[in-house]
Interface confidence: low
Amino acid sequence: SSPTSSASSSSSSAPFLASAVSAQPLLPGQCPALCECSEAARTVKCVNRNLTEVPTDLPPYVRNLFLTGNQLAVLPAGAFARVPPLAELAALNLSGSRLEDVQAGAFEHLPSLRQLDLSHNPLAVLSPFAFSGSNASVSAPSPLVELILNHIVPPEDERNNRSFEGMVVAALRAGGALHGLHRLELASNHFLYLPRDVLAQLPSLRHLDLSNNSLVSLTYVSFRNLTHLESLHLEDNALKVLHNGTLAELQGLPHVRVFLDNNPWVCDCHMADMVAWLKETEVVQGKYQLTCAFPEKMRNRVLLELNSADLDCDPILPPSLQTS
């Protein structure tokens, strides 16, 4: 067959076994309906096709699989399990496919999966065992190196009365399966806080993107064990100040670059330690652009240009003198 083929006719759908494994023998040259395949590039693209399930007849040579812009809704256990297995699949992009439910073991039987992108899906349900594949206290290590979870927050009314942050963190922690993860992107998820142990099971992280969330504080988060961390993106959050414990932990990471732009820094007496740290550190990229948002009298002042005399806290007025 030609290196690039596009199947226009629907191939017969494979019968599914109880374990959701396709038993249909696959011809190396075949390509699923509504997909474009390049055997030379080891790539299959089923993009913007309104698919409601993962094609069963994926060619065994696939290394890069794009299933973006579809209507998958649910990703069941063994969604990519095949006979023979998709042993070479290394990069899987499912972004913007209206996924609402990723079930336990959805990515099982993908021994080479290095990159997974689930961005721009309204994940109302993300199983704690979505990435680990089992509910064992210690799971087999996942081969994942990059996990992209930007803008996966569902609409408010579809959150099942659960903490979205907690749901995501549970999936990241389960069984220690993601010990080898190097990149984690969690941008644009309306996170209000980071659970205390969010990073405990991710010791190999090099790049962590938490930008464009609603984080107000990092007080309970520990970065201490992330000794390989190279970039930490905290731009466009609601951070008011970084306290001594956080500053010390960031300073102790030998390779890190921290991005803090576009946070509403409150330049009062609580900011003194952070300003002193900013003047000394080289870990903050763009530190000369950081400015105060509050109080009003300090708005747009450059943090690095402040001294201790600028950073005062107004005495608290007794209730009788307070105005609404």
Epitope: E230, R257, E282, V283
Partner: antibody, heavy 117, light 108 residues
Framework: QVQLQQSRPELVKPGASVKMSCKAS????????ISWVKQRTGQGLEWIGE????????YYNEKFKGRATLTADKSSSTAYMQLSSLTSEDSAVYFC??????????WGQGTTLTVSS | QIVLTQSPAIMSASLGERVTLTCTAS???????LHWYQQKPGSSPKLWIY???NLASGVPARFSGSGSGTSYSLTISSMEAEDAATYYC?????????FGAGTKLELK
């Protein structure tokens, strides 16, 4: 593996401008800072500035501000440096280097600039 | 700006000799951000020691680095022919980033 491939040698006249390139491969271009470093023949190393392609943050050595312009094209994973109002003092080898506060791990092979009438 | 002064400017050493190159900063530098590079004629510099004392990938164990504050050093426990090169110290503690003028190490 990581590679930084720099553009060919340049021979330009005094007062002119030059734009040299540094094409990155083998890593995610938007994740790492690229610095530019000048080395005159038989001399030491001088930092010109750095660019972070991920957010287009740029820092210059005050000495080169106004004459050096650093840019990056994410689509081609290429960093550029333009130098204007050239004089013979600008004749040197210019290196791009990848890394940051933990050292410049990878360097380009250098672009030789000769400014002569 | 932080000025890094390297001494000596040129040094000759015999095979097997212990060699120490020094780098003095005009003001204190965080030891995480003090690095050394090796450069041979016609080649690009190579990261040799990072964060004062960590050997870069592929650097022989006979090299070591130490120091803090304003005083740093690179030591070769036993000089070999391939070590002949120019060594630069470099600080990433304050902008502008600066390099020392280099120490040229020659084989005697």
């Amino acid at each position: 593996q990581v590679q930084l491939q720099q553009s060919r040698p340049e021979l330009v006249k005094p007062g002119a401008s030059v734009k040299m390139s540094c094409k990155a491969s083998g890593y995610t271009f938007t994740d790492y800072v690229i610095s530019w470093v000048k080395q005159r023949t038989g001399q030491g190393l001088e930092w010109i500035g750095e660019i972070y392609p991920g957010s287009n943050s740029i820092y210059y050595n005050e000495k080169f501000k106004g004459r050096a312009t650093l840019t990056a094209d994410k689509s081609s994973s290429t960093a550029y440096m333009q130098l204007s109002s050239l004089t013979s003092e600008d004749s040197a080898v210019y290196f791009c280097a990848m890394g940051g506060n933990y050292g410049f791990d990878y360097w380009g092979q250098g672009t030789t600039l000769t400014v002569s009438s | 700006q932080i000025v890094l002064t390297q001494s000596p400017a040129i040094m000759s050493a015999s095979l097997g000799e212990r060699v120490t190159l020094t780098c003095t900063a005009s003001s204190s530098v965080n030891s995480n951000y003090l690095h050394w590079y090796q450069q041979k004629p016609g080649s690009s510099p190579k990261l040799w020691i990072y964060s004062t004392s960590n050997l870069a990938s592929g650097v022989p164990a006979r090299f070591s680095g130490s120091g803090s504050g304003t005083s740093y050093s690179l030591t070769i426990s036993s000089m070999e022919a391939e070590d002949a090169a120019t060594y630069y110290c470099h600080q990433y503690h304050r902008s502008p980033l600066t390099f020392g003028a280099g120490t040229k190490l020659e084989l005697k």
